[in-house]
Amino acid sequence: DAHKSEVAHRFKDLGEENFKALVLIAFAQYLQQCPFEDHVKLVNEVTEFAKTCVADESAENCDKSLHTLFGDKLCTVATLRETYGEMADCCAKQEPERNECFLQHKDDNPNLPRLVRPEVDVMCTAFHDNEETFLKKYLYEIARRHPYFYAPELLFFAKRYKAAFTECCQAADKAACLLPKLDELRDEGKASSAKQRLKCASLQKFGERAFKAWAVARLSQRFPKAEFAEVSKLVTDLTKVHTECCHGDLLECADDRADLAKYICENQDSISSKLKECCEKPLLEKSHCIAEVENDEMPADLPSLAADFVESKDVCKNYAEAKDVFLGMFLYEYARRHPDYSVVLLLRLAKTYETTLEKCCAAADPHECYAKVFDRFKPLVEEPQNLIKQNCELFEQLGEYKFQNALLVRYTKKVPQVSTPTLVEVSRNLGKVGSKCCKHPEAKRMPCAEDYLSVVLNQLCVLHEKTPVSDRVTKCCTESLVNRRPCFSALEVDETYVPKEFNAETFTFHADICTLSEKERQIKKQTALVELVKHKPKATKEQLKAVMDDFAAFVEKCCKADDKETCFAEEGKKLVAASQAALGL
């Protein structure tokens, strides 16, 4: 349904508040270094223009595409060349190349200061003084740090952020009310950002087919009572939504997401019995709720898969007639029967099935060739099961911090060229799989763990892509989306790595460590651990553990000392000497 003015269409569909918020998110995700005030000015100009188009869709420039309008606006920024360097060259291009150029310059790790949380009273005053600016600033700060954050979901986070301040700034104990809510939003926000980053990487690096396969598997697990045609329709619509958001088309994305939620709720009888509560909520909550809804119960008496996909004489005929539809049906049927499998495992099984049919349907006796195809699935299923069992046992034995340390050592030995901050961040997140998933019963462990690990390893992949330093990381990240985790799991110690020169400065600590939060102190210790492994990749687990115990004792001793700085200087020398001796540096 073509509209004379796309900008007027979206303004009317979304309403002024959401329109402005989404344009702010879009601009902040593109120009991540621009000051808040500059973005607000640009958004206001776009909004005023949109209003003129609502009043008269035939007005000048109202027929231009959103990319043209937004790109032209971004290219008016005076300091583009000084602030962004070669990104300014994008402005010399025409659409759609200009937008592609902006997308390629999105920075997953922008050089921005850490967000420091002000005192509660300061925040409440700012909230009361100018609620609108306060909330816009939240959108801006999150969007510029997370340039692929799912925009309509960020509106939902902002709504919760506002609700937290509205409630807690009136509470007797403001801090007790507000801080846990802000912590929860921060943690959920980081998780949401990382999940969306994987969706965008899937679309951008592996194409629409890869994303659709992921969506078929996930939606079939979630809606096992829905017909294949219904799941296919949802997959098509969901793919459009995420393609738009990942492509910077945030207005279209939010609009289409709302339409999809509406469709799902109008057709819940043929989709899932679990949607009732979600569908009673307002739009933003509704969409979020649907995205997180629990798996519906599997239909009773589902027939064996073998009949249609192995035993039938028409397997090769059905495959040849419409390969992707047949494979989609296989994936749908397998996934709806296996909510206990990770999505990536289901995709590996589908790939194995596809490879087998490609080979066998060209053979003299196809049926004889593919008759044992399901036997090929067994090792693929057992590999993640065994890995999760082993790692959950290790997690239960060590606890989260020491489990993270074990992973830090493991991954630093695999890919020692990767920067220390990236190794620390990724290994800490990998380690969180323990508390997140090991508490679940067997039937929920694999989908929880392996699909979470896919999200975390994608963080490693996108951070590494910005400054590639390891061929092994590049190989695991680019060869196969669904085999990334097995690829990293299979890496052994990198024997080609030349150990880093020992630098005592890396292991010199000061009294400022004493005022850090427990989390920040852990990060300092884990940074030191990575550096130790980079200096001595052949260090044993026992050696590293002993040195880290020394380090913990050193920090505790000096933080209790009267003259902390002197303690850090004198004891630090002893610690470095002992560590060098222990590791033979």
């Epitope: 002993a546 115990d549 020394d550 913990a552 004792a553 050193f554 505790e556 001793k557 209790k560 004891e571 002893k574 610690l575 000497a577 002992a578 560590s579 001796a581 222990a582």
Partner: nanobody
Framework: HVQLVESGGGLAQAGGSLRLSCAAS????????MGWFRQAPGMEREFVAI???????TYADSVEGRFTVSRDIAKNTVYLEMNSLKPEDTAVYSC?????????????????WGQGTQVTVSS
Amino acid sequence: HVQLVESGGGLAQAGGSLRLSCAASGGTFSNSCMGWFRQAPGMEREFVAIIRSTGHTTYADSVEGRFTVSRDIAKNTVYLEMNSLKPEDTAVYSCVAGVSDYGCYRTSGIKYWGQGTQVTVSS
């Protein structure tokens, strides 16, 4: 001069327990680690467990979860609680005091050694 005197060794059944004690005298150990090494017949001396002045402990993998090291700084005494003993724990156990709080899991990090006490675990 500094003396480290161990006690509590002896014969134990596999799966049984023993508690070793070590009394230090002639010096101050409040700023350095103390702990235990052991040497089985025909084997090299090996690290067992240490405790630093802060209370931070480190154990050899072979004894982790079975042995517990503790100390009483006021009494200049260190202990080793040994549970779920195995025949391979049979050795002479020596009490040690470190040069500093760090590196005490290596012989080069040790300043003082006790004479040792025999522990024999029968199957």
